[in-house]
Amino acid sequence: CKAMHVAQPAVVLASSRGIASFVCEYASPGKATEVRVTVLRQADSQVTEVCAATYMMGNELTFLDDSICTGTSSGNQVNLTIQGLRAMDTGLYICKVELMYPPPYYLGIGNGTQIYVIDPEPCPDSDF
């Protein structure tokens, strides 16, 4: 018996608008109906929780109103989008999946997605 497997892309480049999207896929050992997904960021030996959502299978993924994350779920796959990113937010973003109900509880952690964020160059002043 091993930890639940969670897959996510190794690298993602955020858009010029500071938006990064990636898929978090988990191999569910059972028929979970309630799943909790948490995005963690590891950088400079610090770990912070970026966002978290609990959802019922087949229902929409709902983050808190002030969350920088949005997402959708489809089967054992979660499509995550993080917005408002700046260069200083570059780091390893880890997908943590917990199968909350029904028992037994399972925990899986992905190997992390390195998100690179490059601040856009300011537009040069125009003479026109």
Epitope: K2, M4, T38, V47, P104, G108
Partner: nanobody, 127 residues
Amino acid sequence: EVQLVESGGGLVQPGGSLRLSCAASGSTLDPFVIGWFRQAPGKERETVACINRSRTSYADSVKGRFTISRDNSKNTVYLQMNSLRAEDTAVYYCAASPDKPFYTDQTMCNKHYYGYWTQGTQVTVSS
């Protein structure tokens, strides 16, 4: 699936010792980091120590006093607590995290990575 059960809490005088045990069933401990955490009344849950196959890590407040070890044959992790102080009084929890290649000595004990939390055992240090 992993199931953890901890034991060994109790009342001890300052300067005394206690040993906590965290026994796993349903899985071998091998692919997991096992951590000990504690929570005092009105405070956040904090890291005490953790151990994987090859490394251990401790909170600064317990270094030199507490020792974490694992016995794979018994599928059990131990926390030997010596020179106990009043400030060590708390509910102690055992938890597990899948061991990951990106864990560092500084992050492998971070509570965000853990699950399979036990109910907790009370440790009280008082004369």
